[in-house]
């Protein structure tokens, strides 16, 4: 998602999107200086008029949050950055066509790992996004991707692995040894758009078996 670098003032204008938080980023070229300022505009695909992004006019930082301006995940957008340096002409570069649905990456899920004596329970919490429903609710990833599922793995000493996967949010690995440390990893996948998050990792120890003490 990067434009071609043909200027020494501005390069690599691109969207970086994660969980539908859409940040426009760019680099200053070799000709840029500390007094180079940048202005950001954006538009929906198919529209002619560019809109100036308030808060991202004549700024010195090399990023601009366009999440709210590009929040319709079914639409395509463009953004452009204009760089101005003292005494020089402005240089403008535009992004490739951007779709948050296609281009967003998925962050690791938020998971609670609960040890028991002979099992480990994993509770996946819904991941909120900045995308809003018609009634103003923040949508979760599950409400956007019909095919979203979770892949869970449990590792013991790098030798033995157990696997679970599903569209549920609650899982339990059964038949484990008490008082033993396990490494769990939980990943989000959406097959149709080929998205896969980095794993959430939890290190958890099953509880000691106290029953012998009372027998």
């Amino acid at each position: 998602h990067t434009t071609v670098d043909t200027s020494g003032l501005l390069q690599h204008v691109k969207f970086q999107s994660s969980n539908f938080e859409n940040i426009l980023t760019w680099d200053g070229g070799p000709a840029s200086t500390s007094d180079t300022v940048y202005s950001v505009e954006y538009k929906k695909y198919g529209e002619r008029k560019w809109l100036a992004k308030a808060g991202c006019q004549r700024i010195t930082q090399k990023f601009c949050n366009l999440t709210m301006e590009t929040r319709n995940h079914t639409e395509f957008y463009y953004a452009k950055v204009t760089a101005v340096s003292a005494g020089g002409p402005p240089v403008t570069k535009m992004t490739d066509r951007f779709s948050s649905l296609q281009h967003t990456t998925i962050k690791p899920p938020d998971v609670t790992c609960i040890p028991k004596v002979r099992s480990i329970q994993m509770l996946v919490h819904p991941t909120l996004t900045p995308v809003l429903s018609e009634d103003g609710h923040q949508l979760t990833l599950e409400e956007i991707f019909h095919d979203l599922f979770y892949r869970l793995e449990l590792h013991v000493n790098h030798t033995y692995q157990m696997h679970l996967e599903g569209k549920q949010r609650e899982y339990e690995f059964l038949g484990l040894t008490p008082d033993t440390e396990f490494l769990g990893s939980i990943t989000i996948l959406t097959p149709i758009l080929s998205k896969e998050s980095a794993p959430y990792v939890c290190r958890v120890k099953t509880l000691p078996d106290r029953t012998w003490a009372y027998s």
Partner: antibody, heavy 117, light 107 residues
Framework: EVQLVESGGGLVQPGGSLRLSCAAS????????MYWVRQAPGKGLEFVSV????????HYVESVKGRFTISTDNAKNTLFLQMNSLKSEDTAVYYC??????????WGQGTQVTVSS | DIVMTQSPSSLSASLGDRVTITCQAS??????IDWYQQKPGQAPKLLIY???RLETGVPSRFSGTGSGTSFTLTISGVEAEDLATYYC?????????FGQGTKVELK
Amino acid sequence: EVQLVESGGGLVQPGGSLRLSCAASGFTFSSSWMYWVRQAPGKGLEFVSVINTRSGITHYVESVKGRFTISTDNAKNTLFLQMNSLKSEDTAVYYCATRIQGLIDYWGQGTQVTVSS
Amino acid sequence: DIVMTQSPSSLSASLGDRVTITCQASQSIRSFIDWYQQKPGQAPKLLIYGTSRLETGVPSRFSGTGSGTSFTLTISGVEAEDLATYYCLQDYSWPLTFGQGTKVELK
């Protein structure tokens, strides 16, 4: 207790329209994936369409794209299927179903749609 | 679309028999296969989800195995109430697709 009750089926001529409804209760309707599934006489089951009641995201099977529209009224906990340009091959029992805790395990009793001249 | 090829289309069993139904997916669906039972005039009922996990309240004589593209539903000892049509469903990607169904009848 989860309940899904379909209505709106009937006899319609080819090219005609029909609107099916599914009244839902016993679960959080406003944050769920809801489905229409059909079964032609003596035949197997086919998923027709799905909608997420919160995001409004929809998917359709290819054979009904451009003719059927799935929608909801979240205030009334009701799922709809607007069926236009009906064909004889759309004749079937239409079920609504929902995904709860990751599983499609609740179904209505079905409503019969017959397309015939 | 993912095509689910189910076999046999029908079978005759005596009470107590072990019955096996297979489903082949046209591409990998990982473990995302569910099995439903349908009786005449009724909606389908979920028996097994995620290849092998038994839905609450379903008798333990029902079991499922497989992975990737090849899956099996087994009824270890058929009872009279099991006479019905069984469908596999791939719940991996839209459009979700069923197998053609297997009618289990009494011999």
